[in-house]
């Protein structure tokens, strides 16, 4: 969490951003809130990115003004216009690119004063793994697949019966580049598993951590998955 305060002759207002991560090729949100104002026409929101000449987005007098928007953000940004009056300056970003990573500034002017806060935006790819029994194999194996990751993650397996101990010798992981030549498909096979045990496939890079669990019994297969973004901190 980053909290910024305005300076200058005018009073300062508190602006709060949240460090977040964007999933390449998907739509993202850059979070920013500020002390609300009762008059929409008095509110100016400017989003800027370090190293970029033009603006990322500007909202003033109750509507967007994209006259000075940088070409790299053309047709890709929007604020939640109906929530601005309540202090929400968060930015919607379409089709997140690797190059969108960087330091952004959320700059606010209201009748109460000015304020700004920086936001670190990380970009990468992350997806929930699916764990299945690999029936094609001669032994009882588990196959963990996740379609999109970047940068290349680490993969570890753990077993409940072994008190969460990691298996290093008995699994094999491969990374296959996807068609857009950035993200990769992750496939990991765990060999010689035993029945009535819960196994976890854990995939992690510096942006996200995902887990796929599977429990195989004589009568059923139970699955569970979880994805957690790392380093979401407020400013």
């Amino acid at each position: 969490l980053i909290i910024g305060f305005g300076i200058s002759g005018r009073h300062s207002i508190t602006v709060t951003t949240l460090t977040s991560a964007g999933n390449i090729g998907e739509d993202g949100i850059l979070s920013c809130t500020f002390e609300p104002d009762i008059k929409l026409s008095d509110i100016v929101i400017q989003w800027l990115k370090e190293g970029v000449m033009g603006l990322v987005h500007e909202f003033k007098e109750g509507k967007d003004d994209l006259s000075d928007q940088d070409e790299m953000f053309r047709g890709r940004t929007a604020v939640f216009a109906d929530q601005v009056i309540g202090g929400n300056a968060s930015l919607r970003l379409k089709n997140v690119q690797l190059t969108d990573a960087g330091t952004y500034k959320c700059y606010i002017i209201t009748s109460k004063g000015k304020g700004n806060a920086n936001l670190e935006y990380k970009t990468g790819a992350f997806s929930i793994p699916e764990v299945n029994v690999d029936y094609n194999a001669s032994s009882e194996n588990l196959r963990c697949e996740a379609p999109r990751w970047f940068p290349q993650p680490t993969v570890v397996w753990a077993s409940q019966a072994d008190q969460g101990a990691n298996f290093s010798e008995v699994f094999n992981t491969s990374f296959e580049l996807n068609s857009e030549n950035v993200t990769m498909k992750v496939v990991s096979v765990l060999y010689n598993v035993t029945i009535n045990n819960t196994y976890s496939c854990m995939i992690e890079n510096d942006i996200a951590k995902a887990t796929g669990d599977i429990k195989v019994t004589d009568s059923e297969i139970k699955r569970r998955s979880h994805l957690q973004l790392l380093n979401s901190k407020a400013s």
């Epitope: 090729g25 998907e26 739509d27 509507k63 967007d64 003004d65 994209l66 006259s67 000075d68 928007q69 070409e71 053309r74 047709g75 890709r76 940004t77 929007a78 216009a81 919607r92 379409k94 089709n95 068609s179 857009e180």
Partner: antibody, heavy 120, light 107 residues
Framework: QLQLQESGPGLVKPSETLSLTCTVS??????????WGWIRQPPGKGLEWIGN???????YYNPSLRSRVTISVDTSKNQFSLKLSSVTAADTAVYYC????????????WGQGTLVTVSS | EIVMTQSPATLSVSPGERATLSCRAS??????LAWYQQKPGQAPRLLIY???TRATGIPARFSGSGSGTEFTLTISSLQSEDFAVYYC?????????FGGGTKVEIK
């Protein structure tokens, strides 16, 4: 409500320049949350996005047509225009102008369209 | 560019029946997809944007679903005025592209 109306010659000779104008009424072309776009549709075929312009004059064109297309805006007349150079018979189409959301980028509303035939 | 493929090319349906139109993108477009209706001699009309949000004034019998690469437009009970050509359009990345259209005709 907002309305768009295309105007321009219905017949253009091969190798010449096609010129169309779209007049916006019932609203300002300076409305901040919108681009203004051109789309075309050859007879009996599908739709092709040509490009768009913001009221400040910044443009974006379809790469397949970029070398031949110019879109301009005249805010004083509440109009924007399309020029397509070096036309051939393949450019024969109904040309539509439309308001394009800045994001989401849907087209709404559309002009009624004008048929431009390229023939000598 | 992203290629949009619609199926079927023609759909024959009786009035009152349900119509299901498909649109597939050559790569993920998230939810950045719109649907349009076009009648002969008329301009297209926006029905759906954001894959599932109905445009202003569009009847509830029109609904959109899907995300990523697979999308569906459903007309729950076809009225006589619904017989037309329907186009999907992706606005995920430039250049924006349209599908080839699905003609919904009276059976």
């Amino acid at each position: 409500q907002l309305q768009l109306q295309e105007s321009g010659p219905g017949l253009v000779k091969p190798s010449e320049t096609l010129s169309l104008t779209c007049t916006v009424s019932g609203g300002s072309i300076k409305s901040g949350s919108y681009y203004w776009g051109w789309i075309r549709q050859p007879p009996g075929k599908g739709l092709e996005w040509i490009g768009n312009i913001y009221y400040s004059g910044s443009t974006y064109y379809n790469p397949s047509l970029r070398s031949r297309v110019t879109i301009s805006v005249d805010t004083s007349k509440n109009q924007f225009s399309l020029k397509l150079s070096s036309v051939t018979a393949a450019d024969t189409a109904v040309y539509y102008c439309a308001r394009e959301g800045s994001y989401p980028n849907q087209f709404d509303p559309w002009g009624q369209g004008t048929l431009v035939t390229v023939s000598s | 560019e992203i290629v949009m493929t619609q199926s079927p090319a023609t759909l024959s349906v009786s009035p009152g029946e349900r119509a299901t139109l498909s649109c597939r993108a050559s790569q993920s477009v998230s939810s950045n997809l719109a649907w349009y209706q076009q009648k002969p001699g008329q301009a297209p009309r926006l029905l759906i944007y954001g894959a599932s949000t109905r445009a202003t004034g569009i009847p509830a019998r029109f609904s959109g679903s899907g995300s990523g690469t697979e999308f569906t437009l459903t007309i729950s009970s076809l009225q006589s005025e619904d017989f037309a050509v329907y186009y999907c359009q992706q606005y995920h990345s430039f250049p924006f592209t349209f599908g080839g259209g699905t003609k919904v005709e009276i059976k």
